[in-house]
């Protein structure tokens, strides 16, 4: 899947954790469909 960033957003960002994707793990599976 693809995500595009850089569009305006009103969502608030958590101040305790980065909003970036965590490191990949082999438990990560591609969603079916």
């Amino acid at each position: 899947s693809e995500t595009t960033t850089g569009t305006s957003s009103n969502s608030s960002q958590s101040t305790s954790n980065s909003g970036l994707a965590p490191n990949p793990t082999n438990a990560t599976t591609k969603a079916a469909g």
């Epitope: 899947s1 995500t3 960033t5 850089g6 101040t15 980065s18 970036l20 990949p24 990560t28």
Partner: antibody
Framework: EVQLQQSGPELVKPGASVKISCKAS????????MNWVKQSPEKSLEWIGE????????TFNQKFKAKATLTVDRSSTTAYMHLKSLTSEDSAVYYC???????????WGQGTTLTVSS | DVQITQSPSYLAASPGETITIYCRAS??????LAWYQEKPEKTNRLLIY???TLQSGIPSRFRGSGSGKDFTLTVSGLEPEDFAMYYC?????????FGAGTKLDLK
């Protein structure tokens, strides 16, 4: 030792496309997102996007969504970036960089210089 | 997008001196700012991440501080090899964004 070895300089004509490679070694290739960054004198450093080497999920800077295609080949631990419909504004140095969740872009390739000229 | 304003763009100093580079984010990025060093013929080097954490193998004369919107990189007791380009980058949210860079020159 972690290393990201990028392909050599490219001189291409306007309207053409190019594919830059980034061969990773010295770490578990599937454990980190691979990021791509553009460096030009006009705009300094610009983040293009990243790819998850396991799922091939991608996250793009909107500015580059129509310009760049990101892929990986897990068997050769190599990431690729394909740039299409090239113009003089695409002339720049392009870097691959490994992103760790905690530390951000902790290892960088040496850069690939792209020159678009007729 | 989070805009990052880095200053100064140019700095001249002598070995042994202490210098400070500033980065300001257009909105709060918590602690998530990284600093990089760029030198000709070398790969970019991560110095500091999460505002103040020193990357493995980086000398302790490099120090990062700040949170929220305002951050600083201080280099104490400049060594000859420290004269280079420095960039900050937020790693709090997508898209990742960078400061315009600071060129540290030998006075």
């Amino acid at each position: 030792e972690v290393q990201l070895q990028q392909s050599g300089p490219e001189l291409v004509k306007p309207g053409a496309s190019v594919k830059i490679s980034c061969k990773a070694s010295g770490y578990e290739f599937t454990g980190y997102h691979m990021n791509w960054v553009k460096q030009s004198p006009e705009k300094s450093l610009e983040w293009i996007g990243e790819i998850n080497p396991i799922t091939s999920d991608k996250t793009f800077n909107q500015k580059f969504k129509a310009k760049a295609t990101l892929t990986v080949d897990r068997s050769s631990t190599t990431a690729y970036m394909h740039l299409k419909s090239l113009t003089s504004e695409d002339s720049a140095v392009y870097y691959c960089a490994r992103r760790d969740y905690d530390t951000s872009l902790d290892y960088w390739g040496q850069g690939t210089t792209l020159t678009v000229s007729s | 997008d989070v805009q990052i304003t880095q200053s100064p763009s140019y700095l001249a100093a002598s070995p042994g001196e202490t210098i400070t580079i500033y980065c300001r984010a257009s909105k709060s990025i918590s602690k998530y700012l990284a600093w990089y060093q760029e030198k000709p013929e070398k790969t970019n080097r991560l110095l500091i991440y999460a505002g103040s954490t020193l990357q493995s193998g980086i000398p302790s004369r490099f120090r990062g501080s700040g949170s929220g919107k305002d951050f600083t990189l201080t280099v104490s007791g400049l060594e000859p090899e420290d004269f280079a380009m420095y960039y900050c980058q937020q790693h709090n949210e997508y898209p990742l964004t960078f400061g315009a860079g600071t060129k540290l020159d030998l006075k």
